[in-house]
């Protein structure tokens, strides 16, 4: 059974996962930002199921295709370079998943852009935080 | 595993037409774009398109607007690239490649067109 | 359409050796920018995307920088497999490849 000094490192954990993707998508949304029309191009896979932490998976696997969007986007609203938003990212992701199971993930049908992609993993860790508090 | 196979070598006469095909398999071409890319003997590369599998939707590069057509056909994970008119510069390999947005990750094995009279 | 022009169109090295390519585009791309490889009577085989972003699996000798119009493509330590064809890519306006660079055994 979870600790509570465990469900608070996770609860922070999600909590510093969300502020990034936040903080991701506050920089791209930006109505300065003249390349996001060409940004929502990208096909983003999107998760089928996303309601606990073994899901993450999915954000993990789509990590790389976000670097590059993130590199193409410049923006300066980003305090970090791509490279080490992703890597902070990932590190969380893969604390918060843990690696005792290799679970699969499974993709919708239908891609998404990444503001759609963004505020669907910024759902699920609003989602899971609610149910720690 | 992720594997797009073109269709065989073609030879063809100035001024007919060529109907290259590329099979993919390994992933849902509708979550991808698709791309064509010609390499003539001993020259660089050169895109001449690309279409949207999930619509049908294409973007042609300016040199080939009017003479080239990219279409699918999902039921079978295939994307055609047609081109008329043809002529001995055409002479080329062509290559099928897929992209999530930009650049290509995969790419077929090419195919041979060769515009001799 | 925006140009590529690459440098040098060939170049002979030894390995070990630390290579750069370089690519100047015709108007600023913003990053949108690839790196290719090409081995004889092969397909191409991406290795950067998004300027600097490595693809998975690409050894890490390999790196991509750049700003603006200009773009670097540098291989730290050359491996005897690194001998092949390199072309830059941009995609921010219609996509243009670069003329190439041979890259040869010295």
């Known amino acids: 059974a979870p600790t509570s000094s465990s469900t608070k490192k996770t609860q922070l954990q999600l909590e510093h996962l969300l502020l990034d993707l936040q903080m991701i998508l506050n920089g791209i949304n930006n109505y300065k930002n003249p390349k996001l029309t060409r940004m929502l191009t990208f096909k983003f896979y999107m998760p089928k199921k996303a309601t606990e932490l073994k899901h993450l998976q999915c954000l993990e696997e789509e990590l790389k295709p976000l670097e590059e969007v993130l590199n193409l986007a410049q923006s300066k609203n980003f305090h970090l370079r791509p490279r080490d938003l992703i890597s902070n990212i990932n590190v969380i992701v893969l604390e918060l998943k843990g690696s005792e199971t290799t679970f699969m993930c499974e993709y919708a049908d239908e891609t998404a852009t990444i503001v759609e992609f963004l505020n669907r993993w910024i759902t699920f860790c609003q989602s899971i935080i609610s149910t720690l508090t | 595993q992720v594997q797009l196979v073109q269709s065989g070598a073609e030879v063809k006469k100035p001024g007919a037409s060529v109907k290259v095909s590329c099979k993919a398999s390994?992933?849902?071409?509708?979550?991808?774009?698709m791309h064509w890319v010609r390499q003539a003997p001993g020259q660089g590369l050169e895109w001449m398109g690309r279409i949207d599998p999930a619509n049908g939707n294409t973007k042609y590069a300016p040199k080939f607007q009017g003479r080239v057509t990219m279409t699918r056909d999902t039921s079978t994970s295939t994307v055609y690239m047609e081109l008329s008119s043809l002529r001995s510069e055409d002479t080329a390999v062509y290559y099928c490649?897929?992209?999530?947005?930009?650049?290509?990750?995969?790419w077929g094995q090419g195919t041979t067109v060769t515009v001799s009279s | 359409d925006i140009q590529m022009t690459q440098s040098p169109s060939s170049l002979s090295a030894s390995v070990g050796d630390r290579v750069t390519i370089t690519c100047k585009a015709s108007?600023?791309?913003?990053?949108?920018l690839a790196w290719y490889q090409q081995k004889p009577g092969k397909a191409p085989k991406l290795l950067i995307s998004g300027a600097t972003s490595l693809e998975t699996g690409v050894p890490s000798r390999f790196s991509g920088s750049g700003s603006g119009t200009d773009y670097t493509l540098t291989i730290s330590s050359l491996q005897p497999e690194d001998f092949a064809t390199y072309y830059c890519q941009q995609y921010w306006s219609t996509p243009t490849f670069g003329g190439g660079t041979k890259l040869e055994i010295k």
């Open positions: 108007d600023h791309i913003n990053n949108w």
């Open positions: 390994g992933f849902n071409i509708k979550n991808t774009y």
């Open positions: 490649g897929r992209s999530r947005g930009y650049a290509m990750d995969y």
